[in-house]
């Protein structure tokens, strides 16, 4: 039969005051029959911490259900940790005996010491927006942790990033430490809905890392593409010209029409739609009166997006003599 091993995987467990500490202990065999107890310290002066009776130790709960027949996990959780709880904890197997149980085997022990949790990571993006294909920097900061060892990872939409630099300060001994990391992210045109995540893992977090996020929508500017087209159908003596502004972000946009260089003040119909990737499309319709037009009408659709330099597209209106002479009998 397999010899019983008492496994306490952590040599050191760092916990914060007021929080809950998990002390792990698993056994490799169900034999011999008998309970597993927890003690702090060794020798005759050791202190019983847990004896499978909550009434004796109200701050202690178990991770697994000890009533299950094949249970081999005797890990415990101690709530509301105070400085008085520090010390080395041992899980100890007893063999059922008469008149009393006999100590059979002890685990190697886990030292519980006080640490400090890192603060929630704060992720900051660039001050100004940047267009796709360019690189932007994001910073992540977390403070107040102890001990100094800490792991920081960056993700973009769940994919781990590798282009980042991290510093932990101070370099020498301190009561608490801070971490600052800067990640470089190449923007893609579809990144309006993307997120960068900074993940911080620390021994005091008991396997549950802290995360800070930033939306790339705050950092990206997707410039629009413009297309001006003339509708083949005439409405009476008017021709409909369409300016399609496609795939832009953010929504901030000013559109103006010019006729032969003169800015048109009159109202135009328009629609704004949102694409699946978070970018927008804007369509503007402009009705040109052709009853008294010369042949050389040039229409310009000018777009100023997010405070950038205006871009424009021109269209030389094609108005046939036949169209001009036609009586305006079409219903508007």
């Amino acid at each position: 039969e397999e010899e019983l091993q008492m496994i306490q995987p952590e040599k050191l467990l760092l916990v914060t005051v007021g929080k809950t500490a998990t002390l792990h202990c698993t056994v490799t065999s169900l034999l011999p029959v008998g309970p597993v107890l927890w003690f702090r310290g060794v020798g005759p002066g050791r202190e019983l911490i847990y004896n499978q009776k909550e009434g004796h130790f109200p701050r202690v709960t178990t991770v697994s259900d000890l009533t299950k027949r094949n249970n081999m996990d005797f890990s415990i959780r101690i709530s509301s940790i105070t400085p008085a709880d520090v010390g080395t904890y041992y899980c100890v197997k007893f063999r059922k005996g008469s008149p009393e149980n006999v100590e059979f085997k002890s685990g190697p022990g886990t030292e519980m010491a006080l640490g400090a949790k890192p603060s929630a990571p704060v992720v900051l993006g660039p001050a100004a927006r940047t267009t796709p294909e360019h690189t932007v920097s994001f910073t992540c900061e977390s403070h107040g942790f102890s001990p100094r060892d800490i792991t920081l990872k960056w993700f973009k939409n769940g994919n781990e990033l590798s282009d980042f630099q991290t510093n932990v300060d101070p370099t020498g001994q301190s009561v608490a430490y801070s971490i600052r990391s800067t990640a470089r992210v190449v923007l893609d045109p579809w990144d309006v809905r993307s997120q960068v995540i900074c993940e911080v893992a620390h021994v005091t977090l008991q396997g549950d890392p802290l995360r800070g996020t930033a939306n790339l929508s705050e950092a990206i500017r997707v410039p629009p593409t413009l297309e001006v087209t003339q509708q083949p159908m005439r409405v009476g003596n008017q021709v409909n010209v369409t300016c399609q502004v496609r795939k832009f972000y953010p929504q901030s946009l000013q559109l103006t029409w010019s006729e032969n260089g003169n800015v048109c003040q009159r109202e135009t119909a328009s629609t704004l739609t949102e694409n699946k990737d978070g970018t927008y499309n804007w369509t503007s319709w402009f009705l040109v009166n052709i009853s008294d037009q010369r042949d050389d009408v040039v229409l310009t659709c000018q777009v100023k997006h997010d405070g950038q330099l205006a871009v424009s597209k021109r269209l030389a209106l094609e108005v046939t003599v036949h169209q001009k002479d036609q009586s305006s009998d079409a219903t508007p």
Epitope: G55, H56, P58, T62, T67, I76, S80
Partner: antibody, heavy 119, light 111 residues
Framework: QVQLQQSGAELVRPGVSVKVSCKGS????????MHWVKQSHPKSLEWIGV????????YYNQNFKGKATMTVDKSSSTAYMELARLTSEDSAIYYC????????????WGQGTLVTVSA | NIVLTQSPASLAVSLGQRATISCRAS??????????MHWYQQKPGQPPKLLIY???NLESGIPARFSGSGSRTDFTLTINPVEADDVATYYC?????????FGGGTKLEIK
């Protein structure tokens, strides 16, 4: 079967104290700690604290320190909670609750004791 | 303290339909692969009754119509199909950190 029997409703004047009891039966009383929970509107359910029934060591929610005092009488398998200097804010239903084994959820509850503080 | 926010505050569901109640924690209630989130049902004039423990484990004697899911900060209690006897207020509770805290409750009614 496990039963937690609580004392009856109390109508008390502001400024006085009240002591609510909870008698455990159907199990070994000192094997399980006793928790106390307050239910009032609009604050939903609030954990007051827990007392070890064997040694009588009590641990309180910070919000109830100085307000609630938990004690046990092993001989009668009864847990007590005294509420001091009562105000209208203390008007609520108070429950005692017990966990299953050394689990971390409340498997058994008393029927509740309604405490009404009124002049 | 960990704050638990339940939504909706109340919901009306037709008999035989699915009811979904959400509970969001102000910080993660997971530790070493366990989710320390539990669900209770409370009917008028009665104490709370345990339905689900550790996010997804059905308490003994509770019908399989009740199920729980979720991890870290987002948890869900699902009742499918809803029966007339399910009219009650449902509470989530975390035990990852002291003090244990409860959600504000969700009142379930029949349409």
């Amino acid at each position: 079967q496990v039963q937690l029997q609580q004392s009856g409703a109390e109508l008390v004047r502001p400024g006085v104290s009240v002591k609510v009891s909870c008698k455990g039966s159907g199990y070994t009383f000192t094997d399980y700690a006793m928790h106390w929970v307050k239910q009032s509107h609009p604050k939903s359910l609030e954990w007051i604290g827990v007392i070890g029934t064997y040694y009588g060591d009590a641990y309180y929610n910070q919000n109830f320190k100085g307000k609630a005092t938990m004690t046990v009488d092993k001989s009668s398998s009864t847990a007590y909670m005294e509420l001091a200097r009562l105000t209208s804010e203390d008007s609520a239903i108070y429950y005692c609750a017990r966990r299953a084994g050394t689990s971390d959820w409340f498997a058994y509850w008393g029927q509740g004791t309604l405490v009404t503080v009124s002049a | 303290n960990i704050v638990l926010t339940q939504s909706p505050a109340s919901l009306a569901v037709s008999l035989g339909q699915r009811a979904t109640i959400s509970c969001r924690a102000s910080e993660s209630v997971d530790s070493y692969g366990n989710s320390f989130m539990h669900w209770y049902q409370q009917k008028p004039g009665q104490p709370p009754k345990l339905l689900i423990y550790r996010a997804s484990n059905l308490e003994s004697g509770i019908p399989a119509r009740f199920s729980g899911s979720g991890s870290r900060t987002d948890f869900t209690l699902t009742i499918n199909p809803v029966e007339a006897d399910d009219v009650a207020t449902y509470y989530c509770q975390q035990s990852n950190e002291d003090p244990p805290t409860f959600g504000g409750g969700t009142k379930l009614e029949i349409k």
